[in-house]
């Protein structure tokens, strides 16, 4: 906490420019009104404070709103976001969608802070519901955040936001979230022809049921070994040894080096060792 | 503010159907949120009974899914539960409740007696 | 569906102690889990959501904590309004289940 002192003759801000870069932290204390500081805060972030300089602007804040900052304000506090905790944002109420795109930009690249998932979670909760240009600007700036969702909040997903989701974005879906977003992506492509379709399909496999596979057994896919690794086991079970030739195409000699792991291990029990056979990779049922 | 207000009636006899309604007040129910009907028996414990999301889809709980359903009248921003077949079990505190990620606004609740 | 086991049953404690009431779930739910405290004739009232983000209005000597199937509801320095019943309830996938309730009793 910084002593109070009187600002020193000719030291009052008048605004907030390059100059107040100069002041010790005292003097920033003493010498800029929050007032000024509030509707100014655009200005802070082209001026290169210290970070000290940064926690007297941020304490000056505080004392002038101390039931959680206006939305005027949390719109330009650029660099001064990161100074916040996750209970100085649990005071905000943000409901533009401009004002969480300005803070994320400014933590854009970086991991999730508890400070943005505070923001995020609250401004989702403020709105009742995530709305597709909330969902596409949340995805832009964290690509696994539609992992981060339940199957439950999954389950309002729009199938048009589907569109611009990448297979990396899926990486740390679980069965139970695939199983909802499956159909969306299902509905979302099911316009594109054949092969196009499986290219976009693909990431979401993981939410298939038997039906859908043995479709696309018929349409010479090619799946690789990594996709079949993640397909629903209770789908993959009743899929016959020809279906899964089909399937995999030439990538069905992998089956060998994952005859121990699921869904392999337990297709391979439910099979006629004489269809088996056919394959000519010693799998054993 | 939000506000939610159970009504109904006290006292159903076995067997017969069970409607309650909740009048929303500070926001429309079409808007945003889930919007649920919750359970407390005399012994305090809880159950989630169903909700009617903002844009009308529904889900119920499958203990209850044979016997349940939930509508809404958005004219009137208000939500119903009807419980068909009920039983003494089906005594209990019942109160409905808006919700995102976390059950945030609450009813007073209606107490409700399954007697004959 | 994900059953809730909440521990301990009660609890009693003095004014200003540290109480930790936990949550296990049977399945993993992220950190979709919140709590809730409830006062003898009242409604229940959300006190943290999303695993330990504190409602609006809520002290901050509560604190939410856990992922996955492990969660804590820590109280301290206990006020006399903190005395009632505290519940978990997940939010993963419906059906939504509720613990089974921690009596919170003045010592």
């Known amino acids: 906490e910084v002593e109070k002192t009187a600002c020193p003759s000719g030291k009052k801000a008048p605004e907030i420019d390059e100059s107040l870069i100069f002041y010790k932290k005292w003097e920033l204390e003493a010498c800029v009104d929050a007032a000024l500081l509030a509707t100014q805060m655009d200005r802070v972030n082209a001026i290169p404070f210290t970070y000290e300089q940064l926690d007297v602007l941020k304490h000056k804040l505080d004392e002038l709103y101390p039931q959680g900052y206006p939305e005027s304000v949390i719109q330009h506090l650029g660099y001064l976001f990161l100074k916040m905790s996750p209970e100085d944002i649990r005071k905000w109420n943000v409901t533009s969608l401009e004002t969480l795109k300005a803070l994320l930009e400014v933590n854009k690249g970086h991991e999730m802070s508890p400070q943005v998932a505070t923001l995020i979670d609250r401004f989702v909760k403020g709105r009742g519901q995530l709305d597709k240009d909330t969902l596409d600007t949340l995805t832009a700036f964290y690509p696994g955040y539609l992992c981060s969702l339940s199957p439950e909040e999954l389950s309002s997903v729009p199938p048009s936001s589907i569109w611009a989701v990448r297979p990396q974005d899926l990486d740390t879906c679980d069965p139970r979230q695939l199983d909802v977003l499956y159909p969306k992506a299902r509905l979302a492509f099911q316009n594109m022809n054949g092969s196009e379709y499986f290219v976009k399909i693909q990431s979401f496999l993981g939410g298939a049921p038997t039906e859908d596979l043995k479709a696309l057994s018929q349409q010479n896919v090619s799946m690789d070994l990594a996709t079949f690794m993640k397909l629903r086991t209770d789908a993959v079970l009743p899929l016959t040894v020809a279906e899964v030739q089909k399937l995999l195409g030439p990538h069905v000699e992998g089956l060998k080096a994952e005859e121990r792991h699921r869904p392999v291990r337990d297709w391979i029990l439910r099979q006629r060792q004489d269809d088996l056979d056919t394959l000519g990779l010693g799998l054993q049922g | 503010d939000v506000q939610l207000q159970e009504s109904g009636p006290g006292l159903v006899k076995p067997s017969q159907s069970l409607s309650l309604t909740c009048s929303v007040t500070?926001?429309?129910?079409?808007?945003?949120?889930?919007w649920n009907w919750i359970r407390q028996f005399p012994g305090n414990k809880l159950e989630w009974m169903a909700y009617?999301?903002?844009?009308?889809?529904?889900n119920y709980n499958p203990s209850l899914k044979n016997r349940i359903s939930i509508i809404r009248d958005t004219s009137k921003n208000q939500f119903f539960l009807r419980l068909n077949s009920v039983t003494t079990e089906d005594t209990a505190t019942y109160y409905c409740a808006k919700s995102y990620y976390g059950m945030d606004d609450w009813g007073q609740g209606i107490s409700v007696t399954v007697s004959s | 569906d994900i059953q809730m086991t909440q521990s301990p049953a009660s609890l009693s404690a003095s004014v200003g102690e540290t109480v930790t009431i936990t949550c296990r779930t049977s399945g993993d739910i992220h950190n979709y889990l919140a709590w809730y405290q409830q006062k003898q004739g009242k409604s229940p009232q959300l006190l943290v959501y999303?695993?330990?983000t504190l409602e609006n209005g809520v002290p901050s000597r509560f604190t939410g904590s856990g992922s996955g199937t492990q969660f804590s509801l820590k109280i301290d320095s206990l006020q006399p309004e903190d005395f009632g019943t505290y519940y978990c309830q997940h939010f993963w996938t419906t059906p939504y289940t509720f613990g089974g309730g921690t009596k919170l009793e003045i010592k």
């Open positions: 500070g926001y429309s129910i079409t808007s945003g949120y889930y």
């Open positions: 009617i999301r903002y844009d009308g889809s529904n």
């Open positions: 999303k695993a330990k």
